[in-house]
Amino acid sequence: EEELQVIQPDKSVLVAAGETATLRCTATSLIPVGPIQWFRGAGPGRELIYNQKEGHFPRVTTVSDLTKRNNMDFSIRIGNITPADAGTYYCVKFRKGSPDDVEFKSGAGTELSVRAKPSAPVVSGPAARATPQHTVSFTCESHGFSPRDITLKWFKNGNELSDFQTNVDPVGESVSYSIHSTAKVVLTREDVHSQVICEVAHVTLQGDPLRGTANLSETIRVPPTLEVTQQPVRAENQVNVTCQVRKFYPQRLQLTWLENGNVSRTETASTVTENKDGTYNWMSWLLVNVSAHRDDVKLTCQVEHDGQPAVSKSHDLKVSAHPKEQGSNTAAENTGSNERNIY
C-alpha cells in the first residue's frame, strides 16, 4: 500500500546480438491509474519502445499477461537484438491525465549492452632488434568488442607491467569498440626466453581473458663478449689460440681470424652451445705456426654478429731468440695487447 514505486532490478543486461533481451520492471501498486511505457534514453529525445495503452511494437512482447488481475509485472522482451539496440531503458509509470497522460514515476533504468567479444589481441614489437638496457615498445590491439568496458594488462614473464598507455576508441557511443595499448619494456641480457603478454578481459569472455604474446627472442639482440686465449704449445713451433664468443643472441654470427691484419680464416657459427638463458656460446681456434714468423704476430678475432658492426679482440705473440717458459694470457681490450715470448 506504499506509494507506487517502479522497480527495475537490473542495472545492466548483456545480450549477444541476435538474442532476446529481457528487461525487468515491476510496479508496487495499481495507483495512480495509468499506463506503463518503456523508453530508450531519457529526456525529450527519448525513444518509445513500448506503450501499455496503445501502439504496435512488433519486436516487443510482455513477459506476463497484463490483463490478468493483480499483475504488476511490466517486464518486456525485445527480440532479435542488434548493436543498435544498446542503451539505457526506462520503465515509466504514467498517471491518467487530460488531455495527455502525465509521467508519474520512472524506474532507475536498465543499461542494455549488446555484447560482442573482442578479437584475439595482436602484439607487435619493434621493427628492429634492440640490445639490453634499451627500452622497447610493444603494441597490443583488439577490436570489435561491446560493451566499451574492457581491461587490458601487460605481463613480462608473469610479472605485471605498469609502464603502458591504453586507449579505447571511439570515446563516444558506438556499436563496437577497439583497444590499443603501448607498453614500454626494458630489455635485459636474460630476456631471450622472455615473453611479453597482453591480456584482455571483457564481460563476454566469462572470466577467461584473451592473450596475445610476443617472444622477446624476436626483439632482443645480445652482443657477444669475446675472449682470446693462448693455449699451451702443442709443438715446438705451434701455438693454439682460441676465441671464446660468449652470451650472444641470435645465433647469426661470422668470425674472422686476422694475422697481422691479414685474413687468415672466416667461419660461420654452426655448432654452438646454448646457455640456460637462451644465449649462445661458440669457440673458434687458430693454430699459429710461429716458425713461419720472424717478427711479432698480432692475432685478431673479429666477430660480426647479426649484421652489426664487427667487434674484435687481439692477442700479440712475441717471437724471441731467447726461449723462456711458455704460458698463456688473455687479451683484455681490443686496442691493448699482452705479450708472450714464444720459442
Partner: antibody
C-alpha cells in the same frame, strides 16, 4: 501503529485563510502519499487533493486556485492551506493515507463564521 | 469529473437480511484490467473506513458478509446477512480519474 492527526484553528473568518497540519506517526512520508478530504456537516465526502512522496501534488480542479498542499518529511507533517474561505467551506477536514485511503485521521472541524 | 450516483439514498433492512447498494459512474472507471471503484463505511462521529477496494477485493479485517461486484460504470455493495453493527452511511469512491470522487452516500438502517 499508523496514526494521523489533524490540527486546525477551529474557527476562521470569511475571506481569511485556513492552515491545517496533519501529523503522522508509525510510517514515513517518504513512502506514502497523503490525501486531504473534507465533509460538510451532514453531507458527503469531497476529495481535495494529494501530495505524493516526491512532493508533487494534484488538486481537485474545483478548488485548485485556493489550495496548497506541502509537507516536511523530517517532521512527519503535511500542511493544507486554503485561502478565501466562505461559509460553505465549513467542514470536517481529514487527512488520509495511501492509495485506497486505508487510514484516516479523526478530522478537525473548521467553521467559517464571522 | 466522474460523477458517482448512489441509490438508494437511504435503506432500511431487517436484521439477517441482505442489503444491496448501487453505485453508477458517469463514465467507466475501468483501466488496464481493473475497476478503480472502492467502498467505504462511515459511522457518526468517525472517519470513513475502507471495506472493499478495486470493486471486489475485501479489505483485511472486514467480515466476509461484505462483498463488491461490478465493472465499468455499474457497481454493487452487498451485505449479507446484515447485522446491527452495520448501521452506517456507505460511500462508493473512484480513483480512476482525477479528481478522486465520492458518491453521495447511502444511509443503511437496521430494522
Amino acid at each position: 501503529q499508523v496514526q494521523l492527526k489533524e490540527s486546525g484553528p477551529g474557527l476562521v473568518a470569511p475571506s481569511q485563510s485556513l492552515s491545517i497540519t496533519c501529523t503522522v506517526s508509525g510510517f514515513s512520508l517518504s513512502s506514502y502519499a497523503i490525501h486531504w478530504v473534507r465533509q460538510p456537516p451532514g453531507k458527503g465526502l469531497e476529495w481535495l487533493g494529494v501530495i505524493w512522496t516526491g512532493g508533487s501534488t494534484i488538486y481537485n480542479s474545483a478548488l485548485m486556485s485556493r489550495l496548497n498542499i506541502s509537507k516536511d518529511n523530517s517532521k512527519s507533517q503535511v500542511f493544507l492551506k486554503m485561502n478565501s474561505l466562505q461559509t460553505d467551506d465549513t467542514a470536517m477536514y481529514y487527512c488520509a493515507r495511501g492509495n485506497y485511503l486505508r487510514y484516516w485521521g479523526q478530522g478537525t472541524l473548521v467553521t467559517v463564521s464571522a | 469529473n466522474i460523477v458517482l450516483t448512489q441509490s438508494p439514498a437511504s435503506l432500511a433492512v431487517s436484521l439477517g437480511q441482505r442489503a444491496t447498494i448501487s453505485c453508477r459512474a458517469s463514465e467507466s472507471v475501468d483501466s488496464y484490467g481493473y475497476s478503480y471503484m472502492h467502498w467505504n463505511q462511515q459511522k457518526p462521529g468517525q472517519p470513513p473506513k475502507l471495506l472493499i477496494y478495486l470493486a471486489s477485493d475485501l479489505e483485511s479485517g472486514v467480515p466476509a458478509r461484505f462483498s463488491g461486484s461490478g465493472s465499468r460504470t455499474d457497481f454493487t455493495l452487498t451485505i449479507d446477512p446484515v447485522e446491527a453493527d452495520d448501521a452506517a452511511t456507505y460511500y462508493c469512491q473512484q480513483n480512476n480519474d482525477d479528481p478522486w470522487t465520492f458518491g453521495g452516500g447511502t444511509k443503511l438502517e437496521i430494522k
